[in-house]
Interface confidence: low
């Protein structure tokens, strides 16, 4: 017990000399936050000058204080022992570490490209200032019908599946028994929709090959230069709206 | 901030790539512009560089510029320098927007000179 | 390529007048908004005064204001002051077949 308590007291005595030695060694070390180690004036603690600051104590310099200029704002003043800290002016919102960055806010119902905030496309929406278009829920994939029809805002709203709402349905539908699949009303559903969406898709090539014919090339190369760039659709300056080909909603295509 | 280097004088013919070093913000959230103004003459929009990479030049500097990036830097060479690309060349940071330029570099000169 | 043109070239103001400055567009800007002010002072970078035609730079005082839509726009100063002796620039941006340009600018000086 009393060798214990004799190696506690060692290490105590031991430290505290370290730390006297240190000062001694390196008055530095007895600068304060706020405060500058000034090698020009023999190792005096200076004040920081005028936006600068020092988060912490021992410092042989003090760091400029971020300034918050053009579309930042600032949300804390700087002071001698902390930083500034902005935000994004009002139609900006912040991203990054730290609100590095201020990125345009659109609307709800648009979502931000290359040049500015365009709305949602048909088929999808954005019920934020920020982020992208993001299309509506396919209730079908769930064996469901939409209840609510979707907007540039909101998503559609799912209900309950056509079956469930035939008369004299009971609410919790039983496992429909075993057929023969040709007889399937999904599967003949699936098999109409697939049709009609291969047939919409040959009716938008057909338009986006005329409307490059018209427009010239140029338009064409943009939208494929840029996977990652949620292009402008060729047809912009009629609707407006900022489209991304569904192969590239999963993150761009190769071509 | 954004401060450009690599301005000089040079030979008519030669090649020139002036940098645009960046710092505070990334550029894989920023587009950053070129634009330069002549002696006595008005500023003019020269090329463009997507956080994506994707790049855009006026016509009239299409295959005289090229832009290119790294991680903190955006590099515009001059690929055969004339007289009339003597300027002041700025570069500048925008958000989101190409027209909203909010931070620039103090400028470089360029002199193309026999 | 679209064609930027400002008027007037040069105007002549006096401390605590108004003066208004108008770009005109060959084609609409994109999205109709597109269009951005700059000043311009020697041996400086350009400062943004004005973006999406009408929304005030942070940091700008409210003297500073811009309109317009589409092809025609203006930008006015009112209460000039001293240091508003510059040169001022439209900056349009066009679909992406059209180049993005300046306007020829306005020099702004005191009587």
């Known amino acids: 017990m009393g060798n214990s308590c004799y190696n506690i007291v060692a290490t105590l005595l031991l430290v505290l000399n370290f730390e006297r030695t240190r000062s001694l060694q390196d008055p530095c070390s007895n600068c304060p936050a706020g405060t500058f180690c000034d090698n020009n004036r023999n190792q005096i603690c200076s004040p920081c000058p005028p936006n600068s600051f020092s988060s912490a104590g021992g410092q042989r310099t003090c760091d400029i204080c971020r300034q918050c200029k053009g579309v930042f704002r600032t949300r804390k003043e700087c002071s001698s022992t902390s930083n500034a800290e902005c935000d994004c002016t009002p139609g900006f919102h912040c991203l990054g570490a730290g609100c590095s960055m201020c990125e345009q806010d659109c609307k709800q119902g648009q979502e931000l490209t290359k040049k500015g905030c365009k709305d949602c496309c048909f088929g999808t929406f954005n019920d934020q200032k920020r982020g992208i278009c993001r299309p509506w829920t396919n209730c079908s994939l769930d064996g469901k019908s939409v209840l609510v029809n979707g907007t540039k805002e909101r998503d559609v709203v799912c209900g309950p599946s056509p079956a469930d709402l035939s008369p004299g349905a009971s609410s919790v539908t039983p496992p429909a028994p075993a057929r023969e699949p040709g007889h399937s009303p999904q599967i003949i559903s699936f098999f109409l929709a697939l049709t009609s969406t291969a047939l919409l898709f040959l009716l938008f090539f057909l338009t986006l090959r005329f409307s490059v014919v018209k427009r010239g090339r140029k338009k064409l190369l943009y939208i494929f230069k840029q996977p990652f760039m949620r292009p402008v659709q060729t047809t912009q300056e009629e609707d407006g709206c900022s489209c991304r080909f569904p192969e590239e909603e999963e993150g761009g295509c190769e071509l | 901030s954004l401060e450009e280097s690599g301005g000089r004088l040079v030979t008519p013919g030669g090649s020139l790539t002036l940098t645009c070093t960046v710092s505070?913000?990334?550029?894989?959230?920023?587009?950053i512009s070129w634009v330069r103004q002549a002696p006595g003459k008005g500023l003019e929009w020269v090329a463009i560089?997507?956080?994506?990479?994707t790049t855009d030049y006026a016509r009239w500097a299409k295959g005289r510029f090229t832009i290119s990036k790294t991680s903190t830097t955006v590099d515009l060479k001059i690929n055969s320098p004339t007289t009339e690309d003597t300027a002041t060349y700025f570069c500048?940071?925008?958000?989101?927007?190409?027209?909203?330029?909010?931070?620039w570099g103090p400028g470089t000169l360029v002199t193309v000179s026999s | 390529a679209a064609v930027l043109t400002q008027t007037p070239s040069s105007t002549s103001a006096a401390v605590g007048g108004t003066v208004t400055i108008s770009c005109q567009s060959s084609?609409?800007?994109?999205?109709?908004?597109?269009l951005a002010w700059y000043q311009k002072k020697p041996g400086q970078p350009p400062k943004l005064l004005i973006y999406?035609?009408?929304t005030l730079a942070s940091g700008v005082p409210s003297r500073f204001s811009g309109s317009g839509s589409g092809t025609q726009f203006t930008l006015t100063i009112s209460d000039l002051e001293c240091d508003d002796a510059a040169t001022y620039y439209c900056?349009?941006?066009?679909?992406?077949?059209?180049?993005?340009?300046f306007g020829g600018g306005t020099e702004v000086v005191f009587k």
């Open positions: 084609q609409s800007v994109y999205n109709n908004n597109a």
């Open positions: 505070g913000f990334s550029l894989n959230n920023n587009a």
């Open positions: 560089i997507q956080n994506t990479g």
């Open positions: 500048g940071r925008g958000y989101g927007f190409e027209s909203e330029l909010v931070i």
């Open positions: 900056l349009g941006v066009y679909n992406d077949d059209v180049d993005n340009g």
């Open positions: 999406l035609a009408s």
